[in-house]
């Protein structure tokens, strides 16, 4: 359940914005223009057309000093930073000849795969047709062509071996023109998945479309097998255009249901027929009850690190395994098992963090909670108990980007104590004591406070991508000196387009309430006057380990509501949200739907006290988890909210996915947490919707938060004889994309304007 990213973006209709959903983003303060009279407000059309979308530049690194990039005219260009030269390795003509929308260069630079006929499945997964183009002779490889459609395909890290998944089985090619070697034979639709995740592992555990991993030099290929045979199936109608609707069937474990059974295998790709795939043993303490596999990290060609998690997700085990030539198999000694346990919540943040190994190929760096309950980088050499803490403070390390022999690059929200910022730091690990430098803190201080980074091999160079609060900018830097080499993308056209737009003002501040810090972002109309009264819209997500209050740029639906319709919009990060320590994060453990709602209500009361909110015109809206929170807030009986909207809400945790739900709620059994599962439903509060205007929206083909959730809310409201408004989107999933997006935001705009008595 990751719709918070989508909410932050607002409407993502253009191709550019759609691509950006994989990143994480928000918006700026005014772009100044002295000619006030030529300025215009944002329109809903601007938002729906993606007029003010921005671009980012992530180099596709292929060495320490070279990267590929698709030019504006769709040529694939290789750039060499050191020589300053660039040349086209693949022309747009070749791309167009097979309608390619994506490409991948083999590490030996002899071949390129071209991807076409993209067909989306779930959040990350899709199928496609693949063509292999031989760069040495400028022709497509003929003979032993790849089957179609393929579920996943990738090059080996060295050379030009290919691994691919077709009809849930894994195949290997030593060279693109060779006949394939079939590695697995038991793959079966909706039953056995090899090398690709099933629905729940894709969405809630791996967050990838693949479940296979090459060893660093391509000697071995590791893969997961998911057995979904015993998982209950969610079935829903897909209406399409035919006389009879189709039924979509997905093995989908809801809370407490039977889960997938996972096994990890490794095969020697040099001699794949030698002994066949060898299973990697599961640590005994994990295998004793239901468990998950959470990630695999290759250390060397003959050492691999697997992470496992108990079904009750407060115990994680990291297991380092070695290849034994004698037996052609993998040994995972108990002495190389490292346990991570949470006593106050679940293991990790949203996911358990993954290790970043150092050059000795046994010690590693990893982010986990320190004794004060803040997530920090630790160095593990032998045991977790003896871990050396590398960062510390009342802030959190977010991500380790790269470890070289003398530097560790990471991001955190330390700078100036704003949890919604991200800066990139370098720690010199080659010297003693290690010294820390903030690489980004003072680069473009007003414009850029939220960064991510992308590193070339050995961190020789890196790209910084700044997401705001000003207009996003991407730059290239020297990995040794941190010197900026060039601007990769600065969104000049966007800057010019915004010159005559009256953008809302934005402020990020905090409320201190009963020892809890509530950070909020307030979006204010352009001519905001504190002495006047404004309608207030709360936009909420509020899911565990999410963050809505971030210093990022976005021109989206709520920007329009402030700019044109004169609303004040507020986003509040309450208990359960991330990057402010475990006390706030784990406050919601086993008790979803309580404190998240309380904190939104508390914030609204504080906003009213500020004096510029019309307390008769307050609304709340949210999507996914935010739809759940907005529904519960509307049904809280406080009388604070006049109206509200829930898009694709969860209505009962018994209806949502096991992996996500049980992480935060435990099991829906009498001897565990069934009571709170029952107490935390939206349906249980049907009666309380009587005094609010409620708009309930859902896509009928939502594979993630099933339409069932809204169907049950609607049934409960009807049974309670409570009036409400509803909109369904036929055959639309959790994202409500395409034309549905325009209809959705137009509909919600009308609803809010009516609620706030604003003229149309």
């Amino acid at each position: 359940m990751k719709t918070w990213v989508k909410i932050v973006f607002g409407v993502a209709t253009s191709a550019v914005l759609a691509l950006l959903v994989m990143c994480i983003v928000l918006r700026p303060s005014r772009v100044h223009n002295s000619e006030e009279n030529t300025m215009r407000a944002l329109t809903l059309k601007d938002i729906l057309n993606g007029t003010f979308s921005y671009k980012t530049f992530f180099p596709n690194w292929i060495s320490g000093q070279e990267y590929l990039h698709q030019s504006a005219d769709n040529n694939i260009v290789l750039y060499n930073i050191e020589t300053g030269q660039s040349y086209t390795i693949l022309s747009n003509r070749t791309m167009k000849s097979v309608n390619a929308s994506n490409y991948g260069l083999s590490p030996d630079r002899q071949f390129v795969y071209l991807e076409s006929d993209y067909s989306k499945l779930w959040r990350y997964s899709y199928t496609a047709t693949y063509y292999i183009y031989d760069l040495s002779n400028g022709e497509f490889v003929r003979g032993n062509e790849l089957p179609r459609p393929i579920q996943y395909l990738c090059w080996s890290p060295v050379g030009s071996k290919l691994a691919y998944v077709y009809q849930n089985n894994i195949y290997l090619k030593q060279r693109p023109g060779d006949p394939p070697f079939q590695i697995t034979f038991n793959g079966r639709e909706n039953k056995i998945f090899n090398g690709i995740p099933d629905w729940v592992y894709e969405e809630e555990m791996l967050a990838t479309k693949y479940a296979l991993w090459w060893s660093p030099n391509g000697k071995f290929l590791a893969y997961a097998e998911f057995n979904d045979t015993d998982i209950p199936v969610i079935a829903y109608s897909y209406y399409g255009d035919e006389q009879y609707p189709r039924t979509i069937n997905i093995p989908y474990p809801k809370a407490g249901a039977k889960n997938p059974v996972v096994r990890i295998f490794i095969i020697d790709t040099t001699y794949p027929a030698y002994v066949g795939p060898q299973e990697v043993p599961v640590p005994a303490m994990i295998a004793s009850s239901d468990y998950y596999f959470s990630w695999l990290t290759w250390v060397t060609d003959e050492r691999v690190c697997l992470q496992w998690l108990k079904r009750v997700q407060n115990v994680s085990v990291l297991s380092i395994c070695d290849f034994r030539e004698d037996w052609q198999t993998w040994d995972c000694p108990k002495t190389q098992e490292h346990i991570e346990e949470s006593r106050t919540g679940w293991a990790g943040g949203f996911f358990v963090s993954t290790p970043v190994f150092s050059y000795d190929a046994i010690s590693y760096y990893k982010i986990f909670s320190d004794k004060d309950g803040y997530k920090h980088i630790h160095y593990i050499k032998d045991t977790v108990e003896n871990a050396i803490q590398i960062t510390s403070g009342k802030w959190e390390a977010i991500n380790i980007f790269r470890v070289t022999q003398d530097s560790l690059f990471y991001s955190s929200n330390e700078f100036e104590e704003y949890p919604g910022r991200r800066n990139i730091y370098r720690i010199s690990i080659g010297s003693y004591p290690p010294s820390k430098k903030c690489v980004t803190c003072h680069l473009r201080k007003e414009r850029c406070q939220y960064y991510t980074a992308s590193f070339s091999d050995y961190a020789k160079y890196y790209a910084l991508v700044c997401y705001g609060p000003g207009i996003p900018i991407s730059t290239l830097h020297d990995g040794r000196t941190d010197q900026e080499i060039k601007i990769l993308e600065e969104n000049k056209e966007l800057e010019n387009a915004l010159k005559n737009i009256q953008l809302p003002k934005e402020e990020i501040k905090k409320l201190e309430v009963d020892e809890i810090t509530l950070w909020y972002k307030m979006i204010l109309p352009p001519q905001f006057d504190r002495s006047k009264k404004y309608p207030l819209l709360i936009q909420v997500y509020g899911g565990p380990c999410s963050q809505s209050v971030r210093s990022v740029f976005a021109v989206n639906w709520i920007s329009y509501l402030a700019s044109k319709e004169g609303m004040v919009i507020a986003l509040v990060d309450g208990r359960g949200t991330a990057f402010q320590g475990d006390k706030l994060l784990y406050a919601v453990y086993r008790k979803l739907g309580v404190y998240e709602v309380e904190d939104q209500i508390t914030a609204v009361r504080k906003f009213i006290e500020m004096g510029f909110i019309d307390e008769k015109r307050i609304a709340i809206w949210g999507w996914s988890y935010g739809g759940y929170v907005s529904s519960l807030a509307l049904a809280s009986g406080t009388g604070l909210f006049k109206c509200g909207i829930a898009v694709a809400p969860v209505s009962s945790w018994e209806y949502y996915a096991s992996v996500y739900t049980e992480r935060f709620m435990g099991l829906p059994t009498k001897d565990d947490n069934l009571e709170h599962y029952k107490n935390s439903t939206v349906m249980a509060r049907a009666e309380y919707f009587r005094n609010v205007d409620y708009l309930l929206i859902h896509g009928t083909a939502d594979d993630n938060v099933h339409f069932q959730n809204s169907a049950q809310i609607a049934k409960a409201l009807v049974n309670a004889q409570v009036d409400f408004q509803a909109m369904w989107y036929s055959d639309q999933n959790h994202g409500l994309s395409g034309l549905s997006t325009n209809h959705l935001y137009t509909h919600m705009t009308h609803f809010l304007k009516q609620c706030f008595s604003l003229s149309d």
Partner: nanobody, 119 residues
């Protein structure tokens, strides 16, 4: 469930021969390596011989090279160890092991079969 049952051990004079058998169930021996590990009091555990996969690639401990031969009958899912020119130092309990079991707890191992070389 993976199971390995060893047989064929016994008392033999120096220079004599024995043939050990290992019947496997719960997995296919052609998908793995299967072999013999011996344990003798006061000595380190030793991998005597193993045979791998479809190709039947073999490996022997230096101490048994030229005297012992490992083979497998995939149709019977059984591995064999032909031991010739036996010596007193070959006295040990011989355990059948596979890639599946060798690095796991001893719960997965068979009972073993005892070979005693003595005059």
């Amino acid at each position: 469930e993976v199971q390995l049952v060893e047989s064929g051990g016994g008392l033999v004079q120096p220079g004599g021969s024995l043939r050990l058998s290992c019947a496997a169930s719960g997995f296919n021996i052609k998908d793995t390596c299967i072999g013999w590990v011996r344990r003798a009091p006061g000595k380190e555990e030793e991998l005597v011989a193993r045979i791998c996969g479809q190709i039947g690639s073999t490996r022997y401990a230096d101490s048994v090279k030229g005297r012992f031969t490992i083979s497998a009958d995939t149709s019977k899912n059984t591995a064999y160890l032909q031991m010739n020119s036996l010596r007193a130092e070959d006295t040990a309990v011989y355990y059948c092991a596979t890639s599946y079991t060798v690095y796991r707890s001893y719960d997965y191992w068979g009972q073993g079969t005892t070979v005693t070389v003595s005059s």
